[in-house]
Each structure stands twice: as C-alpha cells, then as structure tokens.
C-alpha cells in the first residue's frame, strides 16, 4: 500500500567495516524522499537521515552504543514536497532491513603493519591497533579493545627469494618469528575472528619487506 507516487525501498543492505556502519537501499528517488529508523529488538525506534534524497544512511552513532546488540532498521518513503502524506493504511510506505549484529557481522578492515624489527635471527612484527568509532568513557576503542582475544592476526611471511608463505598467529598485535640470517623477508597480515562463520577475515595488509623504510635491523 502507499500513495500512488511513492515506491517502497528495497535491497536494504548493511555495509559495515570496523563498526563504521551504513545502511544502503534502492531505488534512487524520483519525486520521493526517505527517512530511516533504527531500533534494537527491545528498544524504541529512533529516526535518522530525515527526508533525504540519498540512498544511504550512516547509522554508526547508533550501533556503537552497544555493538553486541541486534539492530533492525526501516526505510520510510514519502512523496517529495508532501512528507505528511501517508499510504492508504494511514502510514507511509516502509521496508525493513535484515537484522544486524555489529559484533558478529562488521567486516574487519584491512590491517596495517606498523613496524618490524630484526634482532639476530628473530623478527618482531607489530600490527597497528586500529581505532574504531566505538566509545567507552569518552575515548575511542581500538579493534583489540572491542574484540579482545576473539580477534587474532595471521602473519604470512616469506623469503624475498621464494614463493612459499609461512604462517604465524597471535591473539595480541605482535609476532615474534624465527628467520634465517642474511635473508630478506616480506610480511603481510590478515585479521581473523575464528569464532565467526561468515565475515571471518579481513583483506590482507599491504606487503612490507625487509630492507625498506618501515623496518629496523639490528645485528646482535
């Protein structure tokens, strides 16, 4: 139902990386505008992105209040210039989103190798602890703060002269690996949440190689 000149939104999709969360939908509006509402399963609806001609709405501020909650959003369609107009049932046309649980579903952003340091035949590789938009006591939490030991990193490392990738894993942000003396190595890391069944992995970090700026070499 609804007025003859509005169509319901469709293909409502959550796009979320490191808890930065945007709801997207179709169609591009023709003579209509949209308003979004979001709620937890047990909470009240909160309106966002009032009467917008966009087909996306940033809901990060709402979901970061409790990333372990499950959220539902809905997109209302109104005739442009006549937002008080309602459908034949006395309500504007709307469509529900799929449920979304940020902690379980947000994509892991591409990690970054912060540094690596070689001391003899050991290399310490450090992964940058990326800041999220999740707040606690007025400070932004890092990815590690939010996920704790649920988040691991896999390090892929290989001799510059070979193709086989060895792996190491850590539930901190640091790796300590053994390397062959006199060999240059390259590194890439991947963030993983092993307990998940979907959206388990990030994309790989940019590759960093020894002999380039980021690392430090010390002969002991």
């Amino acid at each position: 139902s609804g007025t003859t000149n509005t169509v319901a939104a469709y293909n409502l999709t959550w796009k979320s990386t490191n808890f930065k969360t945007i709801l997207e939908w179709e169609p591009k509006p023709v003579n209509q505008v949209y308003t979004v509402q979001i709620s937890t399963k047990s909470g009240d609806w909160k309106s966002k992105c009032f009467y917008t001609t966009d087909t996306e709405c940033d809901l990060t501020d709402e979901i970061v209040k409790d990333v372990k909650q499950t959220y539902l959003a809905r997109v209302f369609s109104y005739p442009a210039g006549n937002v008080e107009s309602t459908g034949s049932a006395g309500e504007p046309l709307y469509e529900n989103s799929p449920e979304f649980t940020p902690y379980l579903e947000t994509n892991l952003g591409q990690p970054t190798i912060q540094s690596f340091e070689q001391v003899g035949t050991k290399v310490n590789v450090t992964v940058e602890d990326e800041r999220t938009l999740v707040r606690r006591n007025n400070t932004f939490l890092s990815l590690r703060d939010v996920f704790g030991k649920d988040l691991i990193y896999t390090l892929y490392y290989w001799k510059s002269s070979s193709s086989g990738k060895k792996t190491a894993k850590t539930n901190t942000n640091e790796f300590l690996i053994d390397v062959d003396k006199g060999e240059n190595y390259c590194f890439s890391v991947q963030a993983v949440i092993p307990s998940r069944t979907v959206n388990r992995k990030s994309t790989d970090s940019p590759v960093e190689c020894m002999g380039q700026e980021k690392g430090e070499f010390r002969e002991i």
Partner: antibody, heavy 120, light 107 residues
C-alpha cells in the same frame, strides 16, 4: 553441515600425474585455510601443504616442493592438489582438512580421504 | 622444522583404565598443540585444541595439558570406542608437524 569430500585418487605409474579435488559444503573455503595431509599405508600423518583461498598463498612440505601444487576455485568451493612426477613413496591416502585459523591452528573438519597408489 | 616426539608408540589397556599419552616438542610451541583420534579406514577427528581445550562434542573423559614443551593427552576411563590411534600436532609454525602416533589396543 560442514563436509569435505576428496576425489581423484587412483593408480598411477611412477613419473605420472594426478589431480585430487576437495569439494567443500556447509562453509565457504574463502573464509578458511585448506590443508592437504597424507598417510602412507600403516604409517602416521604427514602434512603436505596448505592454501589460503582468500589470497592464494601456499606452502609445501619439503618432500613435495616443486612437484605438487595446491590451488582453489572459490566459485566452485573446491581446493585441488595437482601431483606431478609421482614416486612410489607418494602412495598414501590423501586428506583435505579445514583450518579454522585460530591461534592454535587445529584442523576441525577432515574429508574421508582418497587413495593414491603409485606403482608400475 | 619442529619435531613432535610422541610416546609410547603403542599401549595395551583395559576398559576403565586411565591412559596417558605424551608429546614433546623440539622447541617452544606455546599452546599451539592439538590432539586427534583416528580409527582404521577413517579420517582423524579433533579431540583437543590449544593444548587443553575440549573440542565440541568430545566426551569429557578426554583432557589435555601442557608443561613447557611437554603435552599430555589423558583418557580418564577408557571406553570400548576409544581403542584407536592418537596423534598430537603442532601448528605454532609452518610446517605443522604431527607426532608418530600412539596405538591404544585392548589388553
């Protein structure tokens, strides 16, 4: 239900080639690491190699390096083990296994295995 | 490569017995050790991960522990279905390596 099914085993002459398949269902291989492990008749388990289908990264045991190649087709949700220059000592049951990529790296699901016999 | 030395290679035990299998790593592997059970003609099954965590669906008579580079699998009260071969495995570094296996037979 998570399942891994190997196929492609059989009898092959020394120096010959064989391609094994590992078809996954109940999960997407892109999200995991897939290993191949073999077991010679009456012997223990020997790790062969792995692939991370999300980036194509691989690593092989020294005993098969340069002869075996692991690949994956994420659209088919299948991993492969291409075995070339086969030797008698490659005779074994070949298993594929899923690595959940936890810190300890355990293999939580295994296929039923496929027998490869290298003999003239 | 890290060697995993497993002992004993075989043992005979009776139903109800307490059985202990050990694995020694040639270097530090933290807790990155798993234990598997394999029955003839079947694929291995995961029992213990991270040295001491019981995998889902595995009976609580199985347990794992770590002391430095020594790892132990204990079956508190052996059941008829437990007669099988057991393997330890480290995945602290690539390549992952297995112990030689311990065959648990009926006395």
């Amino acid at each position: 239900e998570v399942q891994l099914v190997e196929s492609g085993g059989g009898l092959v002459q020394p120096g010959g080639s064989l391609r094994l398949s590992c078809a996954a269902s109940g999960f997407t291989i892109f999200d995991y690491i897939i290993h191949w492990v073999r077991q010679a008749p009456g012997k223990g388990l020997e790790w062969v190699g792995y692939i991370d289908p999300s980036n194509g990264y691989t690593y092989y045991a020294d005993s098969v390096k340069g002869r075996f190649t692991i690949s994956a087709d994420t659209s088919k949700n299948t991993a492969y083990l291409q075995m070339n220059s086969l030797r008698a000592e490659d005779t074994a049951v070949y298993y594929c296994a899923r690595d959940i990529q936890s810190v300890s790296g355990e293999f939580d699901y295994w296929g039923q295995g496929t027998l490869v016999t290298v003999s003239s | 490569d890290i060697q995993m030395t497993q002992s004993p290679s075989s043992l005979s035990a009776s139903v109800g017995d307490r059985v202990t299998i050990t694995c020694r790593a040639s270097q530090d592997v933290n807790t990155a050790v798993a234990w598997y059970q394999q029955k003839p003609g079947k694929a291995p099954k995961l029992l213990i991960y991270s040295a001491s965590f019981l995998y889902s669906g595995v009976p609580s008579r199985f347990s794992g522990s770590r002391s430095g580079t020594d790892f132990t699998l204990t079956i508190s009260s052996l059941q008829p279905e437990d007669f099988a071969t057991y393997y330890c495995q480290q995945h602290y570094t690539t390549p992952p390596t297995f112990g030689q296996g311990t065959k648990v037979e009926i006395k």
